[in-house]
């Protein structure tokens, strides 16, 4: 299964820690992806270590653990964020976070 | 049936540098990641780097960072391995693999290309 | 990084005979583990992935298993056209790495 905070907050300019949790008794993880809305903005597996989308690049630091780092937040960076993780034997699981980025006070 | 056909054998000098292409016949580089391996004569497999080419993005071993450049062009499904500053010990048959991304990430390295033959020599 | 250690470095057979590779890691890496067979001459070639699934296209004679830091590669019944390298690999920890290989000869 797959846990996490399904609505966060932060603050304009600032950062945020995306992170999906996951627990199985039998199934191993070989590739998190992390998606916002529908365009990939993360992949990490161990043959491959972290990979991020070059137009992310400069405000997405991977981590800590399998999450990532969102900076410099920007009121467009407001929607849905996606991790899936893929797992052998076990299949496709996915968390789904709301992120609200509030102007600074 | 996806192959990885690799550009030919090379003889280079000490100090210069050799770039092996590896292309995608028949198919493309969509979910799939490229790894480098290389073999020096008489010795086993070790693991240079890695590219993602719908990022474009590369990792490398400690060993071979800041020497090796893997590249992709998603245009013509080809990645390219760059080595620099070459020495003797790099001597060795390099190959490109294929590594699937998503949901098939387990299946390791499924498809070799045939190997690139670099001899470096004064 | 994470050694892996294999055993024998060598070893002859005969046609017939069943076979046990070992691989050993320097720590636990669960059950990510591959095999892979490599002639003279030719790339290497995926035999098992996840330390026990079997490729596909890839006679039953060959099975894997273990998990954490042993593992094992089995020829039920070796075949004329098994003799060959045998290296096992770990992607539980990046970056990837191999061990020093098996050489099964013919006895």
């Known amino acids: 299964t797959i846990d996490t905070k399904r609505n966060i907050s932060a603050e304009e300019g600032g950062s945020v820690i995306l992170q999906c949790h996951f627990s199985s008794d039998t199934a191993e993880v070989t590739q998190v992806d992390w998606k916002q809305q529908d365009q990939l903005l993360a992949i990490y597996s161990v043959d491959l270590g972290w990979h991020v989308a070059s137009v992310f690049s400069d405000r997405v630091v991977p981590g800590p653990s399998l999450g990532l780092t969102f900076q410099s937040l920007t009121m467009n960076d407001t929607g849905e964020y996606f991790c899936t993780y893929h797992t052998y034997p076990g299949g496709i699981y996915k968390g789904r976070i709301f992120l609200k980025v509030q102007e600074s006070s | 049936q996806v192959q990885l056909v690799q550009s030919g054998a090379e003889v280079k000098k000490p100090g210069s540098s050799v770039k092996v292409s590896c292309k995608a016949s028949?198919?493309?580089?969509?979910?799939?990641?490229i790894s480098w391996v290389r073999q020096a004569p008489g010795q086993g497999l070790e693991w240079m780097g890695v590219?993602?080419?719908?990022?474009?993005?590369?990792n490398y071993a400690q060993k071979f960072q800041g020497r090796v450049t893997v590249t992709a062009d998603e245009s013509t499904s080809t990645a390219y391995m760059e080595l620099s500053s070459l020495r003797s010990e790099d001597t060795a048959v390099y190959y490109c693999a294929r590594l699937h991304l998503g949901q098939k990430a387990y299946y390791g390295m499924d498809v070799w290309g045939q190997g690139t033959t670099v001899t470096v020599s004064s | 990084d994470i050694q892996m250690t294999q055993s024998p470095s060598s070893l002859s057979a005969s046609v017939g005979d069943r076979v046990t590779i070992t691989c050993r890691a320097s720590q636990s890496i669960s059950s990510y583990l591959n095999w892979y067979q490599q002639k003279p001459g030719k790339a290497p070639k995926l035999l098992i992935y996840?330390?026990?699934s079997l490729q596909s296209g890839v006679p039953s004679r060959f099975s894997g298993s273990g998990s954490g830091t042993d593992f094992t590669l089995t020829i039920s019944s070796l075949q004329p056209e098994d003799f060959a390298t045998y290296y096992c690999q770990q992607r539980y920890v990046f970056p990837p790495t191999f061990g020093g290989g098996t050489k099964v000869e013919i006895k």
């Open positions: 996840a330390a026990s």
């Open positions: 028949g198919g493309t580089f969509q979910n799939y990641a």
């Open positions: 590219i993602v080419p719908i990022f474009g993005t590369a």
